[in-house]
Interface confidence: medium
């Protein structure tokens, strides 16, 4: 039996700049029941506060609701582990919520096979920003990627589309079924997970509908 090992805060993420969550790895418990507490202060302030919500985001986590989230403020966050033999504290994590946004994936992915006047076929991929993202006001500037592959292929083909919410893919094989996904990233922050997969078959004998 021994004091607990040093915890490590391994991740903090915000879906929308309005709330965020931090998760920690506990380290060894020293063979004893061990309590964990997350405390934080804000840059330039003297007060230290305890995590407002240990439940919402699951075990070994702290959820900061709107009420507790400020942007352009550095949060200085530590996790303390305590058992009857002693305690240990994580290295501090210095977090600015502005930079830890991991949004939901884009929504309403639509796929349409189209044809140019010269009979060249292309796949028109369109989507919308994630619901929570206020793109219009400039609160978020979102960049996108799409990926696609034929059902037979092993590798995804990835296209960066910048701020565009549509993309045309040429040189697809007729008769093949293609899988398509999109993801997005705010100006500062992380790529979302890839969104729901959609599929479409490129017809063998495509003729333009009126």
């Amino acid at each position: 039996q021994s004091p607990p090992g040093k915890p490590e805060i391994h991740k903090c993420r915000s879906p929308d700049k309005e709330t965020f969550t931090c998760w920690w790895n506990p380290g060894s418990d020293g063979g004893l029941p061990t309590n964990y507490s997350l405390t934080y202060s804000k840059e330039g302030e003297k007060n230290t506060y305890e995590c407002p919500d240990y439940k919402t985001s699951g075990p070994n986590s702290c959820f900061f609701s709107k009420q507790y989230t400020s942007i352009w403020k550095i949060y200085i966050i530590t996790v303390n582990a305590t058992n009857e033999m002693g305690s240990s504290t994580s290295d501090p994590l210095y977090v600015d919520v502005t930079y830890i946004v991991e949004p939901e994936p884009p929504r309403n992915l639509t796929l349409e096979v189209k044809q140019l006047k010269d009979k060249k076929t292309y796949l028109w991929v369109k989507w919308l920003p994630p619901t929570i993202t206020d793109v219009k006001t400039g609160w978020f500037t979102m960049e996108y990627e799409i990926r696609l592959k034929s059902e037979e292929a092993d590798e995804w083909e990835i296209h960066f589309t910048g701020h565009q919410t549509q993309f045309k893919v040429f040189d697809l094989y007729p008769g093949q079924k293609y899988l398509v996904q999109t993801r997005c990233k705010p100006d500062h922050g992380y790529w979302s997970r890839w969104g729901q997969e959609k599929s479409i078959e490129i017809p063998n004998d495509f003729t333009l509908k009126d």
Epitope: E8, H10, K11, C12, E43, G44, I74, D91, L93, Y94, V95, D96, T98, Y99, I100, H188, G189, Y190
Partner: antibody, heavy 122, light 112 residues
Framework: EVKLVESGGGLVQPGGSLKLSCAAS????????MFWVRQTPEKSLEWVAY????????YYPDTVKGRFTISRDNAKNTLYLQMSRLKSEDTAMYYC???????????????WGQGTSVTVSS | DVLMTQTPLSLPVSLGDQASISCRSS???????????LEWYLQKPGQSPKLLIY???NRFSGVPDRFSGSGSGTDFTLKISRVEAEDLGVYYC?????????FGSGTKLEIK
């Protein structure tokens, strides 16, 4: 505990090359910008390079631009500095350091390694 | 490049005294995002530099409150309210607002 361990320094002739490594542990390496800083024998400090957490963004001062390349392998938790066309004025102790702030927020070298010595001399 | 000028180069003090180090930048180091990335580092003999203060006045975790930073624009000051033996070493200011980032030449704090 945040730990940075540099290696790869040594004696090299002018015009030669050297690759420094910095092994990182105790934190999620891929979430932090990283820096190389050097200290001359006269004890002046000079920022040499920085690299964004994903490796897509790098910056150098003019004194090393075109000769030095900073890179990282996030799978191996390792930072590198490839130095070529070395000059006597590159003789220094080379430190790797980690940005204080989590992810992309700018500034502050919160953690430093113990340094690795590079001597450029014929 | 932004030139960082530190004064004095050497600062002899008695233990318990207040010490003050000045750092002046050749141009404003207010970043376009409104922050001023002015930092202070202490290098003790035989050790690597350690961060003391970031963004002008914020103490790094574990740094005693006898250290304080102040200033704006181009003029910055590091104050140590009561010097202790463990504070001796070379202090460097650093600006991280404009590339290339630059250090001051250093101020050696030593016993009088």
């Amino acid at each position: 505990e945040v730990k940075l361990v540099e290696s790869g320094g040594g004696l090299v002739q002018p015009g030669g090359s050297l690759k420094l490594s910095c092994a990182a542990s105790g934190f999620t390496f891929s979430d932090y910008y990283m820096f190389w800083v050097r200290q001359t024998p006269e004890k002046s400090l000079e920022w040499v390079a920085y690299i964004s957490n994903g490796g897509g963004s790098t910056y150098y001062p003019d004194t090393v631009k075109g000769r030095f390349t900073i890179s990282r392998d996030n799978a191996k938790n390792t930072l590198y500095l490839q130095m070529s066309r070395l000059k006597s004025e590159d003789t220094a102790m080379y430190y790797c350091s980690r940005q204080l702030f989590y992810y992309g927020s700018r500034g502050a070298m919160g953690y430093w390694g113990q340094g690795t010595s590079v001597t450029v001399s014929s | 490049d932004v030139l960082m000028t530190q004064t004095p180069l050497s600062l002899p003090v008695s233990l318990g005294d207040q010490a003050s180090i000045s750092c002046r930048s050749s141009q404003s180091i207010v970043h376009s995002n409104g922050n001023t990335y002015l930092e202070w580092y202490l290098q003790k003999p035989g050790q690597s530099p350690k961060l003391l203060i970031y963004k002008v006045s914020n103490r790094f975790s574990g740094v005693p409150d006898r250290f304080s930073g102040s200033g704006s624009g181009t003029d910055f000051t590091l104050k140590i309210s009561r010097v202790e033996a463990e504070d001796l070493g070379v202090y460097y200011c650093f600006q991280g607002s404009h590339v290339p980032f630059t250090f001051g030449s250093g101020t050696k704090l030593e016993i009088k």
